[in-house]
């Protein structure tokens, strides 16, 4: 059947290749981290939804994006206990085929929805700050809501492969099932395509748009400050811009790098078992980093504004929202907000407190 040299070779390969990410500390550490993300995420994002919807009455374009961001996070967080159990049980899936598909789709959906929403938020900030007058007609509540519907549809489309190809798989002659991606011969290139799509559509393009938007905002504000040399410069704005871009980048870059390495392994470009083991081990850790930061996003963006902060702390003290609607103008914006009256090019006015939730 197999000659001795081949058998020796196989044994050597097996000795060189650890258990493909199946390490005991992973089965303890990852469920613990998932549990922390679940508790913090559910608490934080629920409060964000309450603050934006009930306290701030969902009046601005950016608040629509922020609300949807929190809702997308909540959808994902609800499936997190399933993944915690799955990892704690050493990648055994006891929840059946239907939940296998739903939970898998939820992970993919959240990635694309949140990244697309953050991208739209950055474009909205750019339009509000750099072109406040020109963009006034375009930046309406209707446009924001339609944009969110399109984002949810696109994210749904991106998570379809998980719904189609994720199925429970009985491991051999045991009653143990796993929630695995199934690929037939005719679609064996799909995992490579999915990995590269995640890299390009789920990170590279959005990051370039976010980077461009905030770079242009930076330049516009710098120009405005240069015009008003006698006014004190507010460096906080520039720190916030840096924080937004770096937070997004460092949240996702580990997961995206390991996703790309996994693609290279599947293509046979990387054939080193040690690297394969590192990728398999690191993948759930990078997921923890990405999704934990992702779930903090609504809080992070919200807390850039004084009003959001005030309502948030008010809610923590159980102070109910006022029954009457706020008197804000609909042109005022949430998260990185800009007052259209404070035109960036104006030399007589101070640059807007543009990173404020109104």
């Amino acid at each position: 059947i197999l000659n001795s040299s081949t058998e020796d070779g196989i044994k050597r390969i097996q000795d060189d290749c650890p258990k493909a990410g199946r390490h005991n500390y992973i089965f303890v550490m990852i469920p613990t981290l998932y549990s922390i993300i679940f508790v913090v995420g559910i608490f934080g994002n629920s409060l964000v939804v309450i603050v934006i919807y009930f306290y701030m009455k969902l009046k601005t374009v950016a608040s629509v994006f922020l609300l949807n961001l929190a809702l997308a996070d909540l959808c994902f967080l609800l499936t997190l206990p399933l993944w915690a159990v799955y990892t704690a049980m050493e990648y055994r899936w006891p929840f059946g085929n239907y939940l296998c598909k739903i939970a898998s789709a939820s992970v993919s959906f959240n990635l694309y929805a949140s990244v697309f929403l953050l991208t739209c938020l950055s474009i909205d900030r750019y339009l509000a700050i750099v072109h406040p007058m020109k963009s006034r007609l375009r930046r309406t509540m209707l446009v924001a809501k339609v944009t969110c519907i399109i984002i949810w549809l696109l994210a749904g489309l991106a998570s379809l492969p998980a719904i189609i190809h994720r199925n429970v798989f009985f491991i051999e002659n045991t009653n143990i099932t796993v929630c695995a991606f199934h690929y037939e011969s005719q679609n064996s290139t799909l995992p490579i395509g999915l990995g590269l799509t995640k890299n390009i559509l789920g990170f590279l393009f959005p990051f370039l748009i976010i980077l461009t938007s905030y770079t242009l905002i930076w330049k516009a504000l710098k120009k405005a400050y240069e015009i008003q040399k006698n006014k004190p410069r507010n460096d906080d704005i520039f720190k916030i811009i840096m924080a937004i871009v770096l937070f997004f980048f460092f949240s996702w870059i580990p997961h995206q790098i390991f996703t790309f390495l996994d693609v290279l392994i599947q293509l046979g470009i990387i054939r080193d078992c040690r690297i394969a083991d590192i990728v398999d081990t690191a993948m759930p850790i990078t997921i923890c980093i990405a999704y934990f930061n992702n779930c903090l996003n609504p809080l992070f963006y919200g807390f850039l504004g004084k009003k959001f902060k005030r309502y948030f702390l008010q809610l923590l003290k159980y102070i109910p929202p006022k029954a009457k609607s706020h008197s804000n103008l609909s042109t005022k914006m949430s998260t990185l907000s800009y007052r259209p009256s404070d035109n960036v090019s104006s030399s007589t006015k101070k640059p807007a407190p543009c990173f404020e939730v109104e």
Partner: nanobody, 118 residues
Framework: EVQLVESGGGLVQPGGSLRLSCAAS????????MGWYRQAPGKGREFVAA???????NYADSVKGRFTISRDNSKNTVYLQMNSLRAEDTAVYYC????????????WGQGTQVTVSS
Amino acid sequence: EVQLVESGGGLVQPGGSLRLSCAASGYIYSRYRMGWYRQAPGKGREFVAAISGGSSTNYADSVKGRFTISRDNSKNTVYLQMNSLRAEDTAVYYCAAYKIDSNPRVYWGQGTQVTVSS
């Protein structure tokens, strides 16, 4: 990418033998466990035999002692030697490559028909 191509199926008389081969193009790690599954008409896919990179094997109770699974990593090929075939072994035999970790994947071949009939 991983592609699995089965061969060796056909018509055989009860008590006869067949050897199925599964050639994997693309790169199959020793971390991928290779297995054979079968699907009889009107039934679900059921496990037949599996082999790890280190050549540890596992068999379904119904084929133990009759079927032997082996693997040649240098050729990226898995074999299923089927002896003392019975009518109930009639099915489409699928080759599978799978890894069970944080991102589990199962790759399936297109299947090869095995018919045991007199």
